[in-house]
């Protein structure tokens, strides 16, 4: 640790005195203290001499000697008082800049330690300190306002009692800066804008921050716009607003608009797009396929996206048949606005019934006209199967009718024993009918097919099963002849069980 001579913590001298402060260390040493007049510095090997032959009150201060090469960073200090009867204060700063909630040191140094008992801190022109100002005093350093607040940004003077009268220091301006958490907050309104050529438009760019020192500008396609700025202060924030008013828009006004604000912490920007169109427009679309297939009993949401300007004047969902004249319940229709010019309309169809298959149309209207988007909803059904015995052209025939959607496939099975359903172990024979006859196939209805199995002799103690399946499920009908070998008997002599 360096050593200072004279080896006293404080030195009190009179104005005009010669002061010599010598610092000695193991290596080179440096003096640190407030820049002030009249000092000269001489280095002599491992010692450094700070001296003046004409000390003034301005030399009052703490002088510290450090050894730059010392890894422990040791230092020694001495405080010099230049006791001037006319100048009780040496003020080391015109201005003190701190952040809110930091301690603010106002460096009024007493030039005479004896005066410490009669010191006080005031605002300029003798005004008292603001309420709740918590401060302390050190003759070496000055007054400290603890946890300074923005509102305490004022001009202060230090007061000392000399011979019964108060002597003031020159003033110190305290600037308490708001702690700026980041770049200014930004809003750009609207987020998107569409106008027909000739209409009026307004774009508002605003920025706010706890500190007044920030810049904001609006640019169009990278060109900075010259717009008068409105400034305001509310909710403890400074606000700067730029408003672009366009009386009659044209195509050159279209494009990207960016609102940019910056301060010492950085820059924020936000953008919007302005579209100028020739005339009103109304576009309907769906992310869904317009042809929908849903299993009966399940639910479906039909969604339509609408892009429109100007806004919609009317819209509704309509059921176009073919099963009934019922209309969708309004409570099942829902509208959500994605943004100003885009909306989503949803029709919820829960637990679909057979009579609800058919065409659903969404209609919308704006000054650009009417538009419609139609969905076709077909219900899927698992196959329903029935088998009868009959004679066709004199031949005994099993006739299987299967009804469902999508169109069912038909398979015949012959198996031993009497059973409701043939299992693998019992199967004697399997016939696939790749092309069953389609009996009916109307839009939105089930498809009914018929498959024929010619049987010369109905075997006793055997079961004939017609199986039908589609993507939804399967159905079957087991035909069990009651008396054996009676192929010549009319069909009513035989029973069949579903």
């Amino acid at each position: 640790i360096p050593v200072i001579e004279p080896s006293v913590p404080e030195l009190v001298v009179k104005p005009g005195a010669t002061v010599t402060l010598r610092c000695v260390g193991n290596g080179s040493v440096e003096w640190d203290g407030p820049p002030s007049p009249h000092w000269t510095l001489y280095s002599d090997g491992s010692s450094s001499i700070l001296s003046t032959n004409n000390a003034t009150f301005q030399n009052t201060g703490t002088y510290r000697c450090t050894e730059p090469g010392d890894p422990l960073g040791g230092s020694a200090a001495i405080h010099l008082y230049v006791k001037d009867p006319a100048r009780p204060w040496n003020v080391l700063a015109q201005e003190v800049v701190v952040f809110e909630d930091q301690d603010a040191l106002l460096p009024c140094l007493l030039t005479d330690p004896v005066l410490e008992a009669g010191v006080s801190l005031v605002r300029v022109r003798g005004r008292p300190l603001m309420r709740h100002t918590n401060y302390s005093f050190s003759p070496w350093h000055g007054f400290t306002i603890h946890r300074a607040k923005f509102i305490q940004s004022q001009d202060y003077q230090c007061s000392a009692l000399m011979g019964g009268r108060k002597v003031m220091s020159i003033s110190i301006r305290l600037k308490v800066q708001k702690v700026i958490p980041g770049p200014p907050a930004l809003t750009l309104v609207p987020a998107e804008l569409v106008r027909i050529r000739g209409e009026a438009a307004q774009i508002v760019c605003s920025a706010s921050s706890v500190d007044v020192n920030f810049d904001v500008f609006l640019q169009h396609n990278n060109t900075k716009l010259a717009i008068p700025q409105q400034s305001d202060f509310h909710n403890n924030r400074y606000q700067k607003v730029l408003t672009l008013n366009l009386d009659q828009v044209d195509f050159q006004h279209a494009g990207n608009y960016s609102c940019v604000a910056s301060n010492v912490q950085g820059k924020h920007s936000t953008s919007m797009f302005f579209r100028v169109v020739e005339s009103a427009y109304l576009n309907l679309s769906s992310e869904q396929n317009l042809i929908q297939e849903v299993t009966v009993g399940e639910g479906l949401n039909l969604k339509v996206m609408v892009e429109a300007y100007p806004g919609l004047q009317g819209f509704n969902w309509t059921y176009l048949g073919p099963f009934s004249d019922h209309q969708p319940e309004p409570k099942l229709a829902n509208a959500t606005t994605k943004d100003t010019y885009r909306h989503t309309f949803t029709l919820s169809l829960p637990r679909l019934k057979p009579s609800e298959a058919g065409r659903y149309s969404f209609l919308a209207r704006n000054p650009g006209g009417w538009r419609a988007l139609t969905f076709e909803l077909t219900l899927r059904y698992p196959p329903e199967v029935s088998v009868i015995w009959t004679f066709i052209n004199g031949s005994g025939t099993l006739l299987c009718a299967a009804s469902g959607y999508p169109q069912p496939n038909v398979t015949w099975l012959q198996c031993s024993g009497h059973t409701d359903r043939c299992d693998e172990a019992q199967v004697l024979q399997v016939w696939d009918d790749p092309y069953p006859e389609v009996l009916s196939q109307e839009p939105f209805h089930k498809v009914t097919v018929q498959s024929l199995l010619t049987v010369e002799t109905l075997e006793h103690n055997q079961t004939y099963e017609c199986r039908a399946h589609n993507s939804v499920g399967s159905g079957s009908w087991a035909f069990i002849p009651i008396s054996a070998g009676a192929h010549t008997h009319p069909p009513d002599e035989f029973l069949f069980t579903p």
Epitope: D32, P34, P35, L41, A93
Partner: antibody, heavy 117, light 110 residues
């Protein structure tokens, strides 16, 4: 060994605020006084102001109304703000350490700031 | 207009001794110590002389400073081509309550 490094935008528009930061490395900002000096192209040096780590500042009277120097000890940095700039403020800005005898013994390499629209 | 006055230029041949003057007033040079700075082309100034006549470590003893009254001077002996630079004087000014500079002297080594 203490080193100083200036940073900030090289171009500022007239009437706007010039903001520069000086980062102190190799030593603590919490001792010594720290200064800003500028030098217009082809001209002499002009002292702008200095600051102590406690926030105490002194400014050149000719610039006082437009200058704020602040310190951030947590980042070992001090900053300069010069408001309402004009073309006459175009200069190389230096940060430097100032000693008891008002000598500038350590300098940054300087940063050129042009004021132009 | 600089507070301290320096000649705008000076020149000398290699090996020669050159002196640069700096004139002030009682509020600066008259009552405070003088510092000198060397600025090589395209670089930052460097402290050359402090407290009238003190050299920081690393500065050759060819450079010396002196002060008398309200004037100061920088002398460079055994001039070398690498001494070609701008030289600035500076001092604390009591009325300004801060440091002031001279306008600078451009030294050319012929």
């Amino acid at each position: 060994q203490v080193q100083l490094q200036e940073s900030g935008p090289g171009l500022v528009k007239p009437s706007e605020t010039l903001s520069l930061t000086c980062t102190v490395s190799g030593g603590s900002i919490s001792s010594y006084y720290w200064s800003w000096i500028r030098q217009p192209p082809g001209k002499g040096l002009e002292w702008i102001g200095y600051i102590y780590y406690s926030g105490s500042t002194n400014y050149n009277p000719s610039l006082k109304s437009r200058v704020t120097i602040s310190v951030d000890t947590s980042k070992n940095q001090f900053s300069l703000k010069l408001s309402s700039v004009t073309a006459a403020d175009t200069a190389v800005f230096y940060c430097a350490r100032i000693t008891v005898t008002s000598a500038f013994d350590i300098w940054g390499q300087g940063t050129m700031v042009t004021v132009s629209s | 207009q600089s507070v301290l006055t320096q000649p705008p230029s000076a020149s000398g041949t290699p090996g020669q001794r050159v002196t640069i003057s700096c004139s002030g007033s009682s509020s600066n040079i008259g009552s405070n110590s003088v510092n000198w700075y060397q600025q090589l082309p395209g670089t930052a100034p460097k402290l050359l002389i402090y407290s009238n006549n003190q050299r920081p470590s690393g500065v050759p003893d060819r450079f010396s400073g002196s002060k008398s009254g309200t004037s100061a001077s920088l002398a460079i002996s055994g001039l070398q081509s690498e001494d070609e630079a701008d030289y600035f004087c500076a001092a604390w000014d009591d009325s300004l309550n801060g440091p002031v500079f001279g306008g600078g002297t451009k030294l050319t080594v012929l």
